[in-house]
């Protein structure tokens, strides 16, 4: 049976995808075939086959970026070390170990789901702009995050969420495979408006909030809130 695991990694970091037999196992590297591949596209990430030290069949996206330890393999640890994680690495990886002396029997089969994350930049909220006499427009921008964010606008006076129908979000996938987001909020003009823009990264359980006030070009002090309570209580806990 295939074991299933999950692991998280930040973009640019190194991560270990675990695939190991119980402690005390010993393996002959002239007997085992080890394959690491992506489950969907069947791309070969790295491998070990007897009497072959070449890794020329590794997919170009993983060449020199995915390694197993020969010393580890001897003791049954076939874990994959993946360097410089990218958003494109967010997928399921499959580790398969076969023993030739056991008639190519499956010794180990592990599927590891890799979740990739990147912190969004602190949002920048533009000074309010008046396209008409009775309307105010705010723009909130945050870049280089992963996965795709949620954007909320808050009435800072009472910490209530503004109606999402008032905002228009545009999310771009940039050259690095990370997300940039621009949210435009249109609200009715009132004498004093104190609003905030919140960028939520669900995977990191992190919210970045910046405020803007009419008549004040400088946003309020940036706030980062990590590990908020459950979604149902998010408003009060995060945007106090």
């Amino acid at each position: 049976d295939t074991q299933e695991k999950e692991v998280r990694a930040m973009v640019g970091s190194d991560v270990e995808l675990s695939c190991a037999c119980p402690e005390g196992s010993r393996f002959d590297l002239n007997d085992v075939y080890v394959y690491w591949q992506t489950s969907e596209s069947k791309t070969v990430v790295t491998y070990h086959i007897p009497q072959n030290s070449s890794l020329e069949n590794v997919d170009s996206r993983y060449r020199n970026r995915a390694l197993m330890s020969p010393a580890g393999m001897l003791r049954g640890d076939f874990s994959l070390r993946l360097f410089n994680v990218t958003p494109q690495d967010e997928q399921k990886f499959h580790c398969l170990v076969l023993s030739q002396s056991l008639g190519f029997q499956e010794v180990l089969s592990v599927e590891v789901t890799l979740h990739v994350a990147a912190n969004f930049s602190v949002p920048v909220v533009s000074a309010p702009h008046s396209p008409s006499q009775d309307e105010l427009t705010f723009t909130c921008t945050s870049i280089n995050g992963y996965p795709r964010p949620n954007v909320y606008w808050i009435n800072k006076t009472d910490n209530s969420l503004l109606d999402q129908a008032l905002q228009n979000d545009t999310v771009f996938l940039n050259m690095r495979g990370l997300y940039d987001v621009v949210s435009v909020l249109r609200i009715a003009r009132t004498p004093s408006v104190n609003i905030g823009c919140c960028i939520e990264n669900v995977l990191l359980q992190q919210n970045l909030t910046v405020g803007s006030q009419t008549g004040n070009d400088i946003g309020e002090r940036d706030k980062i809130t990590e590990n908020p309570v459950s979604t149902g209580e998010k408003n009060a806990a995060t945007w106090s």
Partner: nanobody, 116 residues
Framework: EVQLVESGGGLVQAGGSLRLSCASS????????MGWYRQAPGKVRERVAI???????VYADSVKGRFTISRDNAKNTVYLQMNSLKPEDTAVYYC??????????WGQGTQVTVSS
């Protein structure tokens, strides 16, 4: 993605022979443990023969001495020579890389029918 195309199946009388071929379009053929599998109507798929990258073969007990698996890494092709065929060898025969079997990925297969 690896594409495997099986050929050589057909109708043969008991005691006869067939040679199945499997051509791989993938660039990983030389590192793949390759196998032949079969599925008879109403039965589970079973492994018939498998061969390592260096040519080491392993056979199911039911075909030992009658079937021979071989590979040509230069042609990205694996073969199954089937002699002394029996009616119970009737099935759809599939060729696959062991690593793809683990992912549940299969090709079309080739039908082998042995009449008595």
């Amino acid at each position: 993605e690896v594409q495997l195309v099986e050929s050589g199946g057909g109708l043969v009388q008991a005691g006869g022979s067939l040679r199945l071929s499997c051509a791989s379009s993938g660039s990983t053929f030389s590192i793949d443990v390759m196998g032949w599998y079969r599925q008879a109507p109403g039965k589970v798929r079973e492994r018939v023969a498998i061969i390592g990258t260096g040519g080491f073969p392993v056979y199911a007990d039911s075909v030992k001495g009658r079937f021979t698996i071989s590979r040509d890494n230069a042609k990205n092709t694996v073969y199954l020579q089937m002699n002394s065929l029996k009616p119970e060898d009737t099935a759809v025969y599939y060729c696959n890389a062991a690593r793809l079997v683990a992912l549940g990925s299969w090709g079309q297969g080739t039908q082998v029918t042995v009449s008595s």
